[in-house]
């Protein structure tokens, strides 16, 4: 797996242990928690990152639970089951045998049940809406400059193909980034929009997953773009199945 050969680290994932014990003495990096080998030339899957996050010693964890604003992913952190490719398994269960179905970004999409709960397939999240509010500035950002800067960010920092950034909307102080990626559109080697959104979310919170890189310094024409709150909405290819009780709550 690609990794910086000189000091054997994983540029795209600091939640790894890297050692020169790969084939031919090459650097090999394994995700904390799962021990799965990761490709350090691209983003690590959200499932492996969550697993690594949960495996970190409690006293060493610098990470916090999702804020009260996370309206959709409101179950907080959990230790997920990942498949051999690092994707979320469709059914997740906790230590007390409570189970639920998740989508491809690991967000619960059914009511919780017991071990008899069936999740026939991993439903793909094909549309992600990232809703940001920026801190007050002297004036509004230029929409086209903001659009260009956010597209550049997703292309260069997260290696997401530009075609998957569907739109950037702006009505001061709210910025909305739309990511769209159908199953049929995603080719081998393409970064998943769910992974890109997760890296972005962690960057925005000042919890960068990149090794040794400075935190995210977002600027539009030299003006700092400082985010004060983030909401992320996930739309699945197949609508979620919640009971009416939850829907009316």
């Amino acid at each position: 797996h690609t990794a910086a050969q000189d000091n054997c680290t994983c540029p795209t994932n600091k939640m790894t242990v890297c050692s020169p014990d790969g084939p031919g003495g090459r650097c090999q990096c394994r995700a904390l928690g799962s021990g799965m080998a990761v490709d350090c030339s691209t983003l690590t899957s959200k499932c492996l990152l969550l697993k690594a996050r949960m495996s970190a010693p409690k006293n060493a964890r610098t990470l916090v639970r999702p804020s009260e604003h996370a309206l959709v992913d409101n179950d907080g952190l959990y230790d997920p089951d990942c498949d051999p490719e690092g994707r979320f398994k469709a059914r997740q269960c906790n230590q007390t045998s409570v189970c639920w179905c998740v989508n491809s970004v690991g967000v619960r999409r059914t009511d919780k049940g017991d071990l008899s709960l069936r999740c026939d397939e991993l439903v793909r999240t094909h549309h992600i809406l990232i809703d940001l509010r920026h801190r007050p500035t002297a004036g509004a950002f230029n929409h086209s400059d903001l659009d260009a800067e956010l597209r550049r960010l997703f292309r260069e920092r997260y290696r997401l193909h530009p075609k998957f950034v569907a739109a950037v909307h702006y009505e001061q102080p709210t910025i909305q980034i739309e990511l769209r990626q159908n199953t049929s559109q995603k080719a081998a080697g393409d970064v998943d929009i769910g992974d890109a959104a997760y890296y972005f979310e962690r960057d925005i919170k000042g919890e960068s997953l990149f090794q040794g890189r400075g935190g995210l310094d977002l600027r539009v024409r030299g003006e700092p773009l400082q985010v004060e709150r983030t909401l992320i909405y996930y739309l699945d290819e197949i609508p979620p199945k919640f009971s009416m009780k939850r829907l009316t709550a």
């Epitope: 050692s19 014990d21 003495g25 021990g35 799965m36 080998a37 498949d83 051999p84 490719e85």
Partner: antibody, heavy 117, light 107 residues
């Protein structure tokens, strides 16, 4: 030549702890994972966990998580495996093994730990 | 955790015969499998890594194949010193796990 030399056999009483050492030579000690594998009499191989000597990152098999501690001393290129609250079923040969290229390439000679009252 | 199931548990063969040992993983592990030989009173010895890559110093009669969930160790023509227990082991993810072993005994 890569060598892993383990400490000698131990006899312990139930409830006690045992600390087995594994001294590495012939390669860069900090560059390769050291794993611990045990084998009860007449049984198969069981992975207990591993340690990466460069930064002391440890990863334990859930079965032993509350009882096992792996440490290292880079000055002597030695890794230690301590198992506490011993019971009779912990009677086994304990092996350390250097891991590279996705396999346990080099093994220590094994340390027999007998737990008996 | 990934469970490895080896079969048969015992294989009774004569020197010169071909031995075929199987190892099945509970989920797809690509080629992250290794094979070991263990003789009584000795530590295991690595024979094959990455499912099919031979280790220097290991006789050419030992070969491995397979990927995904089904793996095979083949000993093309058994020598007297090959009668031992053979284990498969996965390194796809932690916890690393071993199969229960296959004992190759003299018929």
């Amino acid at each position: 030549e890569v060598q892993l030399v383990q400490s000698g056999a131990e006899v312990k009483k139930p409830g006690a702890s045992v600390k087995v050492s594994c001294k590495a030579s012939g390669y860069t000690f900090t560059s390769y994972w050291i794993n611990w594998v045990r084998q009860a009499p007449g049984q198969g191989l069981e992975w207990m966990g591993n340690i990466y000597p460069s930064n002391s990152y440890t990863n334990y098999n859930q079965k032993f998580k509350d009882r096992v501690t792996m440490t290292r001393d880079t000055s002597t290129s030695t890794v230690y495996m301590e198992l506490s609250s011993l019971r009779s079923e912990d009677t086994a040969v304990y092996y350390c093994s250097s891991y590279r290229s996705d396999a346990f390439a080099y093994w220590g000679q094994g340390t027999l730990v007998t737990v008996s009252s | 955790e990934i469970v490895l199931t080896q079969s048969p548990a015992t294989l009774s063969l004569s020197p010169g015969e071909r031995a075929t040992l199987s190892c099945r993983a509970s989920q797809n592990i690509g080629t992250s499998i290794a094979w070991y030989q263990q003789k009584p009173g000795q530590a295991p010895r690595l024979l094959i890594e990455f499912a099919s890559e031979s280790i220097s110093g290991i006789p050419a009669r030992f070969s491995g194949s397979g990927s995904g969930t089904d793996f095979t160790l083949t000993i093309s023509s058994l020598e007297p010193e090959d009668f031992a227990v053979y284990y498969c082991q996965q390194s796809n993810s932690w916890p690393f796990t071993f199969g229960g072993g296959t004992k190759v005994e003299i018929k």
